[in-house]
Interface confidence: low
């Protein structure tokens, strides 16, 4: 896939900021705004943030320029500098009226065909399970086969350097065809295949992936909070995985979710899938040691062990992919929609 | 700690009206979904009405539907349910009940409950 | 609406013994079932969650089982207070429903 370029997004935040640039009000009040970072803090929802005037009369100057609205793409170039802005006018929208973080990411959806060349699989046994022969898919795929193998070699060994491998899982997730990465993550198992779940677990190499000693999930965001991109990767997941009704209805749709969910991994808030008999994931992270915001701490542990949407997108995105596989296509080669809604 | 507290259960004629009311405390009550259940004398739980946190979205069981009106007051941390046209199969114990903090996407969870009201619908 | 169909509805045994309760559901609820355990006159009270898990507080001689449509709760040895009358719940599907209970009675 090219990435997409600035101009095919409706307002991207480098475009605006060099629009502002141009504008000595705009360009003072929004280096102003910048300075006042220090001075305030990302409060938590319970609490008010106090702001000096200076700070709040250069988010006045901002509420008027094209920064305000302005949005980034997943797979952009220079993404992290678009995202630094976004954050830094974000701070603009919500000073004086708290207002809950919103995805800085725009949902330029494409519906390109995904081509599968399943002939090259009958070198597998027929028995196979699924996430063997996505394995295969992807290794059949130079980009695909490039870009995980460049991920297997740094988060595997004993001394693997987390950061580096971390790094190397967001370039596969952010990087690889979406079908290929999805295929690889969200790959169905027989319940009582616990070989096939141990792949599926280990797919994000989380020996190396996830902390060793599970940190306190606050922290873990507090963490991710302090990174832009780590910071919009959790609120795009939490706008799009967000259930609706008692029902488990995603807030968008399902497959925005997913997208937001594969997004996490190689951030500070990756996600896994918790064991090899059951498709149930989960932060690494613990809410032991909460104090007074245990309930807060669970809420957030909640929204990815325990959220019907989330949950419900991963199996429906898994039955598409038994399907794949269970039915007589006409051809070996084949097209698949690469963004499905399947809400 | 958790507190959930029914009121408003009394003896009322068939077809009168009556208001129950859920006072919670001990979390953030605007961030859950609250439910009431009720229980006949001697027989099992029934799931009455459920209303989300923001109180946008309400569900009623079949048997109360069009007759009985769930709502909340988050400033004041408390949940409703308003009675009308009752009749003598809505005698029981009403009880109010909400998710605990680690299910509280799950809006149909009943980790916690109130001590319950007893509404009594005869002449 | 999904049916929780429980039995025995009654049971009668020993303080020590070990009983199971079972619950099945009309059609497939995942892992979303609760277990709960209602004394005369008091609220019912929440034992297990999502079909397996031990709520915090409740005694680990309580345990839960299953997925899809058969689930179960068993009671390792029966302590006086555990003759009380035991409860299911599905919260997969709107509306929610509960099982008819299981009186656990004193030999």
């Known amino acids: 896939d090219p990435l997409p370029t600035e101009s095919r997004l409706m307002n991207s935040c480098l475009q605006a900021r060099r629009k502002c640039q141009a504008d000595p009000t705009c360009s003072a009040a929004y280096h102003h705004l910048d300075s006042c970072t220090s001075s305030i803090s990302t409060p938590l929802p319970s609490e008010e943030p106090s702001v000096p005037a200076d700070c709040l009369e250069a988010a006045q100057q901002l509420r008027n320029s094209s920064l305000i609205g302005c949005m980034c793409h997943r797979r952009m170039k220079n993404q992290v500098a678009c995202l630094d802005i976004y954050w830094t006018v974000h701070r603009a929208r919500s000073l004086g009226n708290y207002e809950l973080d919103v995805s800085p990411y725009e949902d330029t959806v494409t519906s390109k065909p995904w081509k599968m060349n399943l002939s090259k699989l009958n070198m597998l046994k027929p028995d196979s399970d699924l996430c063997l022969k996505f394995a295969m898919l992807c290794t059949l795929n130079d980009k695909c086969d490039r870009l995980r193998k460049a991920y297997g070699e740094a988060c595997s060994g004993p001394h693997c350097q987390r950061h580096v491998c971390l790094r190397q899982l967001l370039t596969f997730f952010e990087k690889a065809a979406e079908p290929h990465a999805q295929g690889l993550l969200l790959c169905p198992c027989a319940p009582n295949d616990r070989g096939c779940g141990e792949r599926r677990r280990n797919t994000i190499a989380p020996n190396c992936a996830l902390p060793p000693v599970a940190p306190n999930c606050l922290e873990l965001r507090r963490l991710c909070f302090s990174d832009p991109l780590c910071r919009s990767r959790l609120v795009d997941f939490q706008t799009h995985c967000h259930p609706m009704d008692i029902l488990g209805t995603c807030a968008t749709e399902q497959s925005r979710c997913l997208r937001a969910y594969l997004g996490l991994i190689g951030t500070a808030m990756t996600p896994n899938f918790v064991s090899n008999v059951n498709t149930s994931v989960a932060l690494s992270c613990t809410c032991r040691g909460s104090g007074n915001l245990q309930e807060e701490c669970e809420m957030l542990e909640g929204f990815f062990s325990h959220n019907p949407c989330l949950t419900e997108a991963i199996a429906a995105k898994m039955r598409f992919h038994s399907q794949l596989f269970s039915q007589d296509w006409p051809h070996p080669t084949f097209a698949v929609m690469a963004h499905q809604n399947e809400n | 700690e958790v507190q959930l507290l029914e009121s408003g259960g009394n003896l009322v004629q068939p077809g009168g009206s009556l208001r129950l009311s859920c006072a919670a405390s001990?979390?953030?009550?605007?961030?859950?979904?609250m439910t009431w259940v009720r229980q006949a004398p001697g027989k099992g739980l029934e799931w009455v009405s459920t209303?989300?946190?923001?109180?946008?979205?309400?569900y009623y069981a079949d048997s109360v539907k069009g007759r009985f009106t769930i709502s909340r007051d988050n400033s004041r941390d408390t949940v409703f349910l308003q009675m009308n046209s009752l009749r003598a199969e809505d005698t029981a114990v009403y009880y109010c009940?909400?998710?605990?903090?680690?299910?509280?996407?799950?809006?149909?969870?009943?980790?916690?409950w109130g001590q319950g009201t007893l509404v009594t619908v005869s002449s | 609406d999904i049916q929780m169909t429980q039995s025995p509805s009654s049971l009668s045994a020993f303080v020590g013994d070990r009983v199971t309760i079972t619950c099945r559901a009309s059609?497939?609820?995942?892992?979303?079932l609760d277990w709960f355990q209602q004394k005369p006159g008091k609220a019912p009270k929440s034992l297990i969650y999502?079909?397996?898990n031990l709520q915090s507080g409740v005694p680990s001689r309580f345990g839960g089982s299953g997925s899809g449509t058969d689930f179960t709760l068993t009671i390792n040895s029966l302590q006086p207070e555990d003759f009380v009358t035991y409860y299911c719940?599905?919260?997969?599907?709107?509306?929610?429903?509960f099982g008819g209970g299981t009186k656990v009675e004193i030999k």
């Open positions: 999502a079909a397996s």
């Open positions: 719940q599905q919260y997969n599907s709107y509306p929610p429903t």
């Open positions: 001990g979390f953030t009550f605007s961030s859950y979904a």
């Open positions: 209303i989300s946190g923001s109180g946008t979205s309400t």
């Open positions: 009940s909400k998710p605990s903090a680690l299910r509280f996407l799950h809006w149909l969870c009943m980790d916690v």
């Open positions: 059609q497939d609820i995942r892992n979303y």
